[in-house]
């Protein structure tokens, strides 16, 4: 005897994702990155906001800073001095650009349980950090650098020429922060804190972007940012080093720029300390296909820094730009002169090389038709790196160990078989001497963070396994995901397809293409996400596809550099090619195909809609670039050269969205932008809108007042609700 109706079958209790789930962040995950303070100790902020010290060897944990102390100054962040005497507490966080922010800092003395009084830090501070040894402090206030030997001491002022929007000391200007370093700081302590290196950026001749910030005053404020657009005057950079023990003795000493770099416009790209008296600087020509790595030594007799030509290593690309998105950084070995670095091999794949004397004599450490992505750590006997080698899926990341102490070197994949179904995309965080490390797995299953022994690779414990998320997802009908490839005209197009839960190949579904497509990007990755497109598949029954076409990363230089000097052509072609292939699969309703993207993706989606193919019914561009003449010099010129007649002006002009205004006539276009976008200026969308109006083409638009490139806060909810309505209307889906 069985009941005639089953009330609690799995199907009945399962529900689709809702837009509310996404906007509320109901299914967000946690990761656990230990804040390492020694070979076997790390700090972590507990759920109740205590700062806890963990000792892996003993299994013991200790609260070193109570939530009460944190709360007393409304601290949102902290930093322990290396001598463990003091903690800085950070509060009044105020965001500036992508990485930069200002804050108020309080110093707490752990030995007496009191805040340091006297010679308090000024506010707001732009950047602050401890020396690597002891408890010296370096900080940037009003674009100048200051040094304290101890937190309670009066400060020593290192620079005096700092001026808002003119001279930046120890912090980058807008373009260096976003496109070159990319960090909020531009100062670097030597390993034992003897020296402090810093960059000075002179923006006096850079044209200024100005936009209104409406706020709620009677008159809007004007935001002014020195922002070099393609072809404009760039910042002038200088690097100085000061002895922090006797800072007044000789003062800051400038590090010389290699002659072959200094002969024309150039960039500084990174600084790596090797020892307390050896430093490595990387420079780049403005035409970014030549990079120079320069190793400099301290001359005790002259108290200067010497950078002999014999210690200059040149990296040049003949088929594109130097490096991937950025020129890679060296990881020095224990001899303090040789180093490991990722750059293209003779077959055009980015691999680890060992450089002992010259780049020409570099020893290739990894090889194959895949790419090494990051070098995490080099110890006396091991090198840890990540790559996408395993099973030939470019969108995966596994961690490998190469034994460099033995010959021939042996390679071991540390992560490939750990949790094979759940985890195919890893990063790692190593303690001192790689005694222990944390693995953070981002998917494709629910993310998990684990702690491992650096010698044996044994898992010691789970740091975070997102149990609550796992339980919350038990009654959710998640979409299915597939990662596959299309082979088209000798090009491999990897794609990720997100399919509705009850997907049936014999039915027809609306298709949404989500595109980014920028140079050296990757969208098709084996990572976990429950986001807007998950909802569109789960609840609204759409198929969503992401395609990595020409110009994307980690599949070799042929694909990567295909877009060199020709942005806006192949990226768009490859999205269109993929759509045609998806239609051939038989389950796409070819009358209901849309495309959307943000930033570079907004540029590509706009060009795809205006391609005249008739493939797309509608599309959305959020904060798109519309002309490369409007975007930042460092980024744009890397891929496009200069907008001059004798260089690449013609393609700059040909690749604008405005030039295709007429072609938007037969598509539904939704254009969206924040008015306070410091990155891709509102100007871009204003020009698209003007061109469409002038061409008498109907379109929809939404601006977000005082919002930047991220459209965060309440704007996010409004944005995704608005885009959902637009797509449902386009696909004739009932509300």
């Amino acid at each position: 005897l069985r009941p005639s109706r089953v009330h609690n079958s799995e199907e009945n209790t399962m529900r689709a994702l809702t837009l509310k789930d996404i906007l509320n962040g109901t299914f967000s995950y946690k990761t656990f990155f230990p804040n390492w303070i020694s070979g076997q100790e790390y700090l972590h902020q507990s759920a109740d906001n205590n700062i806890v010290l963990y000792n892996i060897e003993t299994g013991q944990s200790y609260t070193i800073l109570s939530n009460r102390t944190m709360k007393s100054v409304n601290a949102s962040n902290y930093g322990l001095s290396p001598d463990r005497q003091f903690v800085y507490l950070e509060s009044d966080y105020s965001k500036l650009w992508r990485y930069s922010y200002t804050a108020t800092y309080y110093i707490y003395d752990l030995s007496n349980g009191e805040f340091v009084r006297g010679n308090e830090l000024p506010r707001p501070i732009q950047y602050l950090c401890w020396s690597p040894v002891g408890s010296k402090l370096a900080y940037v206030y009003q674009n100048n650098i200051y040094l304290k030997q101890r937190p309670g001491d009066p400060p020593f002022q290192i620079t005096f020429n700092g001026r808002e929007n003119k001279i930046f000391n120890g912090i980058p200007d807008w373009v260096y922060e976003e496109e070159m370093l990319p960090t909020k700081y531009a100062l670097w302590w030597s390993p034992n804190g003897k020296f402090l290196a810093y960059a000075e950026f002179n923006d006096k001749d850079i044209p200024v972007i100005a936009y209104s910030y409406y706020g709620d005053e009677q008159y809007p404020r004007t935001i002014n940012i020195p922002y070099p657009k393609a072809g404009a005057k760039n910042p002038v950079v200088r690097i100085f080093i000061i002895d922090t023990t006797y800072p007044a003795y000789v003062g800051p000493q400038e590090v010389p720029v290699p002659a072959m770099i200094a002969s024309s416009d150039y960039y500084f790209s990174w600084l790596t300390w090797v020892t307390d008296e050896r430093v490595c600087l990387q420079w780049l020509k403005r035409v970014q296909n030549v990079s120079v790595l320069s190793i400099c030594d301290f001359r005790e007799d002259w108290q200067t820094w010497d950078c002999p030509k014999t210690q200059e290593h040149i990296e040049e690309s003949r088929t594109g730009w130097a490096g991937g998105f950025f020129v890679s950084r060296p990881v020095f070995s224990y001899d303090a002169i040789s180093y490991y670095k990722i750059f293209s091999d003779k077959d055009g794949y980015k691999h680890i090389h060992y450089i002992k004397d010259t780049v020409e004599n570099a020893i290739q450490i990894t090889s194959g038709k895949w790419e090494a992505i990051n070098i995490f750590r080099v110890t006396q006997d091991s090198l840890f790196y990540s790559s996408n080698e395993f099973e030939e899926y470019p969108g995966r990341r596994n961690i490998y160990r190469i034994s460099i102490g033995s010959y021939p070197p042996s390679k071991k994949c540390v992560t490939c078989h750990l949790r094979k179904e759940r985890c195919q995309y890893y990063t790692a965080s190593f303690s001192d001497y790689a005694k222990y490390y944390a693995l953070v797995c981002y998917g494709p299953g629910i993310p998990i963070s684990t702690l491992h022994d650096g010698r044996t690779d044994q898992e010691i414990k789970i740091l975070e396994e997102n149990k609550e998320l796992e339980n919350a997802l038990k009654n959710i009908q998640l979409p299915k995901e597939e990662i596959k490839k299309l082979e088209v005209d000798e090009i491999t197009l990897w794609y990720k397809m997100i399919l509705p839960p009850q997907f049936d190949r014999s039915k027809k579904y609306p298709l949404l293409i989500q595109v980014y497509g920028g140079p050296c990007s990757q969208s098709v990755r084996s990572v976990f996400a429950v986001n807007w497109i998950s909802y569109l598949a789960s609840k609204e029954g759409m198929v969503i596809a992401l395609v990595d076409g020409r110009g994307t990363a980690f599949q070799g230089d042929k694909l990567l550099y295909a877009v060199y000097r020709k942005l806006g052509v192949y990226e768009v072609e490859d999205q269109i090619t993929a759509v045609r292939k998806f239609i051939e699969m038989g389950f796409i309703d070819e009358k209901r195909i849309a495309i959307w993207g943000w930033s570079y993706g907004g540029y590509v989606s706009s060009l795809a809609l205006a391609s005249g193919t008739g493939l797309f019914k509608c599309g959305i561009a959020v904060a798109p670039v519309s002309s490369w003449e409007y975007y930042a010099s460092v980024y744009t010129e890397r891929f496009m050269g200069l907008p001059t007649k004798d260089d690449n002006l013609e393609h700059y002009k040909n690749s604008t969205v405005m030039a295709r205004a007429e072609y938007f006539r037969n598509v539904d276009y939704l254009l969206i932008h924040g008015t306070a976008d410091d990155n891709v200026h509102f100007q871009n969308s204003a020009q698209i809108a003007k061109a469409l109006v002038n061409a008498q083409v109907d379109f929809q638009a939404m601006w977000y007042s005082d919002q930047n490139h991220g459209l965060s806060g309440l704007s996010t909810n409004h944005l995704y609700t608005h885009m959902t309505h637009f797509l449902k209307q386009c696909f004739s889906l009932s509300d």
């Epitope: 100790e41 010290l53 001598d83 003395d109 752990l110 349980g113």
Partner: nanobody
Framework: QVQLQESGGGLVEAEGSLRLSCAAS????????MGWFRQAPGKSRELVAA???????YYADSVKGRFTISRDNARNTVYLQTNSLKPEDTAVYYC?????????????????WGQGTQVTVSS
């Protein structure tokens, strides 16, 4: 240089208490951070409690609320009051000293050690 000598260990029943003392030689005792470590058979030596020169204390989570560390600079002595003892607290308890911060949990960071005093907790 500082010499350390522990006392006060012994055999005690579960839930019982002991007060361990560590006498230090040297006139600069007040400038040292002092710590109590313990080592159970077959286990590594672990920091149980520490007190900075300024009097700030901290404890391993496993003993928090049960053990109290204190110092008497006039007597050059540091104390560990152990209450609500459990069989897993059985170990040799060592007194240790270091200049600078007390917030170090690795034995290698503590240069000065006593000989140790045995604490046995029976069930």
């Amino acid at each position: 240089q500082v010499q350390l000598q522990e006392s006060g260990g012994g055999l005690v029943e579960a839930e019982g208490s002991l007060r361990l003392s560590c006498a230090a030689s040297g006139r600069t005792f007040g400038s040292y951070a002092m710590g109590w470590f313990r080592q159970a058979p077959g286990k590594s030596r672990e920091l149980v409690a520490a007190i900075s020169s300024g009097g700030t204390t901290y404890y391993a989570d496993s003993v928090k609320g049960r053990f109290t560390i204190s110092r008497d600079n006039a007597r050059n002595t540091v104390y560990l009051q152990t209450n609500s003892l459990k069989p897993e607290d059985t170990a040799v308890y060592y007194c240790a000293a270091r200049t600078g911060s007390a917030y170090y949990t690795n034995r290698i960071d503590w240069p000065y050690w006593g000989q140790g005093t045995q604490v046995t907790v029976s069930s």
